[in-house]
Amino acid sequence: ALDTNYCFRNLEENCCVRPLYIDFRQDLGWKWVHEPKGYYANFCSGPCPYLRSADTTHSTVLGLYNTLNPEASASPCCVPQDLEPLTILYYVGRTPKVEQLSNMVVKSCKCS
Amino acid sequence: ALDTNYCFRNLEENCCVRPLYIDFRQDLGWKWVHEPKGYYANFCSGPCPYLRSADTTHSTVLGLYNTLNPEASASPCCVPQDLEPLTILYYVGRTPKVEQLSNMVVKSCKCS
């Protein structure tokens, strides 16, 4: 699987999850998030050669098409597969609120 | 929605579904498919600016991050959202077989 365990160890050039630390205030301008100050959101990148973690029949077909017609530039793209939530603390007035934001952390990627 | 109806009419530069006709024999080397000879598989391409048909909270965050940090090159990617099956006819010996291949035709795209 193209997950953090594999990708962060092997530094694959093809489609894989990459580490990306986001500071809420500095990188997004979100001053309202009190904790955490930032988190590893990660992201997916890298080429999707034929059959690499193909998501659907279409991505398999498109990968083959691109292999046989490389000038066509129509190839699958490396995108998130498994995502995890992130719990944040913020304030409404002086009242602390804890909320779980869904799909905030990329754990693995696929070619779609 | 970034679907064929909208995208094929408007020729959007940002993330949209693009027409792609695939001839099974010529483009894939699949001589075993008897009918159809080819089909519109389509594909997704185009930039994913902040908030364009964002798939998850992560793609929204990544889109904002990329807007504020354009040199970072970590941005969402335009990939299939809705796919449809394709019915094909092939032969096993002299016996005709009809099969529905799932997820063969891209009908719409999203930024993931």
């Epitope: 017609n69 530039s73 | 064929t4 009419r9 408007n10 792609l20 006709y21 010529q26």
Partner: nanobody, 119 residues
Framework: QLQLVESGGGLVQPGGSLTLSCAAS????????MSWVRQAPGKGLEWVSV????????HYSDSVKGRFAISRDNAKNTLYLQMNSLKPEDTAVYYC????????????RGQGTQVTVSS
């Protein structure tokens, strides 16, 4: 089976005009964008123009903008390219292509039509 048949090419003097046609069959023509591409002698395929499925949206390469006009007749399953103020550098084999050739350079399906601009 998808088929595209181009016609209307010929020999024309610089500054002259031609109208190319492309008859399409084997698919629902009215649903898809269509393009014109060309191949000059010894060169690769060059995108010329694209038109949206309903004919409302059109784009042109910088080299032909203001001189060429793309159009379509969905009732007749036909694509057109009106070429005005022709230049010697427009000499090429012209192909129509299913889809938007700005994004995908697939193989040419038709036989093309030769346009030669010369005095």
């Amino acid at each position: 089976q998808l088929q595209l048949v181009e016609s209307g090419g010929g020999l024309v003097q610089p500054g002259g005009s031609l109208t190319l046609s492309c008859a399409a069959s084997g698919f629902t023509f009215s649903l898809y964008p269509m393009s014109w591409v060309r191949q000059a002698p010894g060169k690769g395929l060059e995108w010329v123009s694209v038109i949206g499925s309903d004919g409302g949206t059109k784009h042109y390469s910088d080299s032909v903008k203001g001189r060429f006009a793309i159009s379509r007749d969905n009732a007749k399953n036909t694509l057109y390219l009106q070429m005005n103020s022709l230049k010697p550098e427009d000499t090429a084999v012209y192909y129509c292509a299913e889809g938007d050739s700005r994004y995908v350079r697939g193989r040419t399906r038709g036989q093309g039509t030769q346009v030669t601009v010369s005095s």
